[in-house]
């Protein structure tokens, strides 16, 4: 599996989605677990509805939620007001019994909020890692615009 | 009508080469996964491993791995069966099952092939 | 792996008597991964129990199956002649698939 690599701003929301072929894992829950290190193993962050039928209401953890859209096929994951703490690498999974199937690894980056001004020396930025060379990034860099804000920087 | 329908039987020698079929009718071939089991004469219920024809995607059973190969043609709705280097022990009916997709259930076989008798001896 | 033991290995009884079956697993199961099959002489294996509990399509409602954990149990309430076969159970839920050795039930 490459990593898909999904950026946000921290305190706002970051959705990662993870598309799977939906008859392959029809019937199957499924999952979004952290990795524990490279090796290490994947601790089981939120999972969707017990009955499978009902996997499209929205399932919380703390700040974590996970829903599947069954038919067509896209798990998907919020992290709301994320956190440098946040950032790490990540599995969405297809569960069967006691055995899962890794539908997407995810690296999550916590970018600061450009309009906060506090030190952002803590905030974990990924340095250049071998196992994420081939990592597909998506941008998904999303906050809500405030009032009378332009939404880009005038051209000159 | 749903169904599975596999080649007729074979008798080989051991050494020899085989590969079996079992061909899909009646439903959409590359939306289920198919496994296959083999039952030794006068014997139980052995599951192989799977394979999901939509892309390939195969599991086998440790006691098989690397004993047989579990292929598909989904252009042909036709998962495959075979041995390099068949043994006397390879003496047996092989059947071959669709996973059920029932929700919250995938993975009972609902529907069989007749299945294919392979007798190696010398 | 699961290891799932059939007893008792043959059962013998009239038609219209009651079977039970009993299959044990190893490991806990959910019971949405245990199935229920039967077999006679030359014929492919036929779902008729799927989650523990559930009748596959076609299936009269003499067979039933119960039981959760580590116990599963299929019920026959009135034997038929055409009933009399080999059962074997099955579990899915952790890989590999693995099946009972089998009840062979015969008629008395």
């Known amino acids: 599996h490459n990593t898909t690599v999904f950026q946000g701003v921290a305190g706002q929301s970051l959705q990662v989605s993870c598309p799977y072929d939906s008859m392959k894992h029809w019937g199957r829950r499924k999952a979004w677990c952290r990795q524990l290190g490279e090796k290490g193993p994947c601790q089981r962050v939120v999972s969707t509805h017990n009955l499978w039928l009902l996997s499209f209401l929205r399932r919380w953890n703390g700040s974590t939620a996970i829903t599947d859209d069954t038919l067509g096929g896209t798990l998907t994951i919020t992290l709301r007001n994320l956190q440098p703490h946040d950032a790490g690498l990540y599995q969405c999974q297809s569960l069967h019994g006691s055995e899962a199937d890794t539908l997407r690894k995810v690296l999550v980056e916590v970018l600061a909020d450009p309009l906060d001004h506090r030190d952002a020396g803590d905030l974990w930025f990924p340095g250049e890692s071998e196992s994420f060379e081939d990592a597909h990034v998506e941008h998904s860099i999303s906050r809500s615009l405030l009032e009378g804000e332009i939404p880009f920087p005038p051209t000159s | 009508e749903v169904q599975l329908v596999q080649s007729g039987a074979e008798v080989k020698k051991p050494g020899e080469s085989l590969k079996i079929s079992c061909k899909g009718s009646g439903y959409s071939f590359t939306s289920y996964w198919i496994g296959w089991v083999r039952q030794m004469p006068g014997k139980g219920l052995e599951w192989m491993g799977i394979i999901y024809p939509g892309d390939s995607d195969t599991r086998y059973s440790p006691s098989f791995q690397g004993q047989v190969t579990i292929s598909a043609d989904k252009s042909i709705s036709t998962a495959y069966l075979q041995w390099s280097t068949l043994k006397a022990s390879d003496t047996a009916i092989y059947y071959c099952?669709?996973?059920?997709?029932?929700?919250?259930?995938?993975?009972?076989?609902?529907?069989w092939g007749q299945g294919t008798m392979v007798t190696v001896s010398s | 792996e699961f290891v799932l033991t059939q007893s008792p290995g043959t059962l013998s009884l009239s038609p219209g008597e009651r079977a039970t079956l009993s299959c044990r697993a190893s490991?806990?199961?959910?019971?949405?991964?245990l199935a229920w099959y039967q077999q006679k002489p030359g014929q492919a294996p036929r779902l008729l129990i799927y989650?523990?509990?559930s009748r596959a399509t076609g299936i009269p409602d003499r067979f039933s199956g119960s039981g959760s954990g580590t116990d599963f149990t299929l019920t026959i309430s009135r034997l038929e002649p055409e009933d009399f076969a080999v059962y074997y159970c099955q579990q899915f839920d952790s890989s590999p698939i693995t099946f009972g050795r089998g009840t062979r039930l015969d008629i008395k």
């Open positions: 099952a669709r996973h059920d997709i029932i929700p919250a259930a995938p993975g009972a076989f609902d529907i």
């Open positions: 490991q806990i199961i959910s019971s949405n991964y």
């Open positions: 989650s523990a509990s």
